[in-house]
Interface confidence: low
């Protein structure tokens, strides 16, 4: 004796990404000489056994046997979501339901709000937005490989009533180390299956210059030629360099871009030299003590910031 359940068809719920393909499989143990049928959420018959009932080329027969009816729906749209019904026309009619969930793929995020030429210690505020996700996606921020804590993701329903637009903002105080950094907004969603979908915004940070003095050669002796290079750093890179010698009339003559040249060193060149590197962000003075009597000039540790 067959139990009543042997004539009860069974199926499973399916989740599919928009644009993908879903397979609906319905099985029954005892078909009682009846055919299986699939119908859509609008109660339109799709297949009755191996016979196509709806003219939709996206819907194809996968398998039709007395115990199984499997069909595939390709290029699935959001509108295809809903409960699909497998029926077997025994007495009484028995049915099984398959809930098809269609995931909306979030669009590549868009970053707005970047103001160019941020100054050090100013606050950068960036906004990120992505449309088309279903269910609503999550947005995350990072600076390089460091996570940034943006505000909670805001969710707004798209005009189609099915998908969502998500947005998030992040604010942080910039430092000189952030110059050239990439701020990345990533969208996280089950439809992406771990794939990266992100947008980056490279930021520029303006900061005050620093400078240091490098002798060439490193250990000059009396009678040698000496170049004192003034190496300025900053954004923008310092464009103006002024050399002074303590106790002398400023400024000293400069050659070879930012370098001070001594064609033939003598003891009277001994003393403390200062180089002021200037950009439109400010100035910085580095000092160097030159002792021609000593074959190893020692850079002083003092430097002055303006």
């Amino acid at each position: 004796n067959l139990s009543q359940d042997d004539s009860q068809p069974w199926t499973s719920d399916e989740t599919v990404v928009a644009g993908g393909t879903v397979v609906l499989k319905c099985q029954v143990k005892d078909h009682e000489d009846s055919s299986l049928q699939w119908s859509n959420p609008a109660q339109q018959t799709l297949y009755f056994g191996e016979k196509r009932a709806l003219r939709d080329n996206r819907i194809q027969l996968v398998s039709s046997t007395p115990h199984e009816l499997s069909i595939s729906i390709s290029n699935v749209a959001l509108a295809d979501e809903g409960e699909y019904t497998c029926s077997i026309f025994t007495m009484p009619v028995r049915t099984a339901k398959s809930l098809v969930t269609v995931l909306g793929i979030p669009q590549k995020p868009i970053i707005t709000g970047y103001k160019s030429s941020l100054r050090e210690k100013e606050t950068a505020t960036l906004n990120c937005q992505s449309s088309g996700s279903k269910p609503a996606a999550q947005l995350t921020w990072r600076k390089g490989d460091q996570e940034l804590h943006g505000d909670q993701t805001r969710i707004q329903e798209d005009p189609n009533g099915k998908t969502f637009t998500v947005s998030s903002s992040v604010s942080f105080q910039v430092t000189r180390e952030d110059d050239g950094a990439n701020i990345v907004c990533s969208v996280n969603h089950e439809s992406l299956k771990g794939a990266d979908r992100s947008t980056s915004q490279r930021i520029e940070v303006l900061y005050t210059p620093t400078a240091m003095i490098r002798p060439e050669p490193a250990h000059p002796r009396e009678g040698q030629k000496l170049l004192l290079h003034c190496e300025g750093r900053g954004n923008p890179v310092p464009q103006q360099y002024v050399w002074v010698k303590e106790g002398s009339e400023p400024p000293l003559k400069m050659t070879q871009e930012s370098a001070l040249i001594f064609p033939f060193l003598n003891k009277s060149d001994s003393g403390t030299y200062g180089c002021t590197a200037t950009s439109n962000m400010g100035s910085y003075t580095a000092y160097f003590t030159l002792n021609v009597n000593d074959p190893s000039p020692v850079p002083s540790s003092s430097s002055t910031y303006h």
Epitope: G144, G180, N182, R202, M212, E231, R233, G234, V237
Partner: nanobody, 124 residues
Framework: QVQLVESGGGLVQPGGSLRLSCAAS????????RGWFRQAPGKGREFVAA????????NYADSAKGRFTISRDNSKNTVYLQMNSLRAEDTAVYYC?????????????????WGQGTLVTVSS
Amino acid sequence: QVQLVESGGGLVQPGGSLRLSCAASGRTFSNYARGWFRQAPGKGREFVAAIDYSGGSTNYADSAKGRFTISRDNSKNTVYLQMNSLRAEDTAVYYCAAPASRRPSWDADGYDYWGQGTLVTVSS
């Protein structure tokens, strides 16, 4: 955050060659200068070579001129140091460094980020 990883060191005979690599991660290092320094046992850290962000400007210590070549591949965020005609006095730990600026520097104080170093031993 910022990571510089050197590789390519090892044992080589005098007159031999090695190519060191320095891979960067954690920020867009292609826009910044990069330098190689070395530190021999019992000695201070010494400048070897530097290259600017574009690769258009390079500088070498006197001890490296004519034998060492610094280059960079910004698409891989990697800087290389090709070392030829190696001598016993080149034995040292070689460090890759990056400054937080677009200008190459020749002094260790001018660099903000440092790798862990790779050992180069020149010996017969």
